[in-house]
């Protein structure tokens, strides 16, 4: 697994460097997670033809993956820092059950899948410190998550492969949109 942000050899070699600001730390954390997703997508795409499949709609019916919309305040039109931050944190919390599903879905990248999951938890903590309106953030219901996980794990092999592909793709796109918005804050 890759070394978490702030622990690479470059950091050790430069002890006099300015400490990262909160925004820089968040930026670096998201890029680290995106690197992890890239590695996982590589394994998924090499293992099956899911990345070229046009039958995504079949699997998407079972998923309710978080997605950015205009009303979320993360795009230039209607940009709203607080609304957007709430959407980013809420979305990441909703992705957690899907990241749990990804565990045990990889053979050669098992550590990488765990690193993506753990790094996302750290990212949520960073973002919660940044948010002023924590009351607006809704946490997913654990019982609902548990039954969703069971349902996903009970799918046939093809649907499980497609679900894995869709989760990685959607999570990547959500993080990209989130980081673009965070860079405006």
């Amino acid at each position: 697994a890759p070394v978490p942000p702030g622990e690479d050899s470059k950091d050790v070699a430069a002890p006099h460097r300015q400490p990262l600001t909160s925004s820089e730390r968040i930026d670096k954390q998201i890029r680290y997670i995106l690197d992890g997703i890239s590695a996982l997508r590589k394994e998924t795409c090499n293992k099956s033809n899911m990345c070229e499949s046009s039958k995504e709609a079949l699997a998407e019916n079972n998923l309710n993956l978080p997605k950015m919309a205009e009303k979320d305040g993360c795009f230039q039109s209607g940009f709203n820092e607080e609304t957007c931050l709430v959407k980013i944190i809420t979305g990441l919390l909703e992705f957690e059950v899907y990241l749990e599903y990804l565990q045990n879905r990889f053979e050669s990248s098992e550590e990488q899948a765990r690193a993506v999951q753990m790094s996302t938890k750290v990212l949520i903590q960073f973002l919660q410190k940044k948010a002023k309106n924590l009351d607006a953030i809704t946490t997913p219901d654990p019982t609902t998550n548990a039954s969703l996980l069971t349902k996903l794990q009970a799918q046939n092999q093809w649907l499980q492969d497609m679900t894995t592909h869709l989760i990685l793709r959607s999570f990547k796109e959500f993080l990209q949109s989130s980081l673009r918005a965070l860079r405006q804050m």
Epitope: L34, F75, Q76, K172, Q176, S177, L179, R180, R183, Q184
Partner: nanobody
Framework: EVQLVESGGGLVQAGGPLRLSCTVS????????MGWFRQAPGKEREFVAD????????WYADSVKGRFTISRDNAKNVMYLQMNSLKPEDTAVYYC?????????????????WGQGTQVTVSS
């Protein structure tokens, strides 16, 4: 890393249009976020616009909003900047840039590949 080549610059009358192109070599073009920056004589390079991989997240600098339009064609590996109602203060060297993380943003540091630039001169 990808190679970027800008074209379409030139001399244009104030109020006129111009379309810049940025041609990208590399099969991964469709995964990159792309941006346009510009540098006027004696000034810092500044952000103009950026676009994500599937064109659903586009940002513009306030100074060009409503006049410039950024777009891309992933099948042709090209990004465009349609500039309308040009003003003398738009005179600059225009650079295209690519971000391999697919994010983009208003700072130079967010991009890992750059073109050589194309000169745009707007005469009054």
């Amino acid at each position: 890393e990808v190679q970027l080549v800008e074209s379409g610059g030139g001399l244009v009358q104030a109020g006129g249009p111009l379309r810049l192109s940025c041609t990208v070599s590399g099969r991964t073009f469709s995964t990159y976020a792309m941006g346009w920056f510009r540098q006027a004589p004696g000034k810092e390079r500044e952000f103009v616009a950026d676009i994500n991989w599937n064109s659903d997240n586009i940002w513009y600098a306030d100074s060009v909003k409503g006049r410039f339009t950024i777009s891309r064609d992933n099948a042709k590996n090209v990004m465009y900047l349609q500039m309308n109602s040009l003003k003398p203060e738009d005179t600059a060297v225009y650079y295209c840039a690519a971000d391999s993380y697919g994010v983009g943003g208003g700072k130079e540091e967010y991009y890992d590949s750059w073109g050589q630039g194309t000169q745009v001169t707007v005469s009054s």
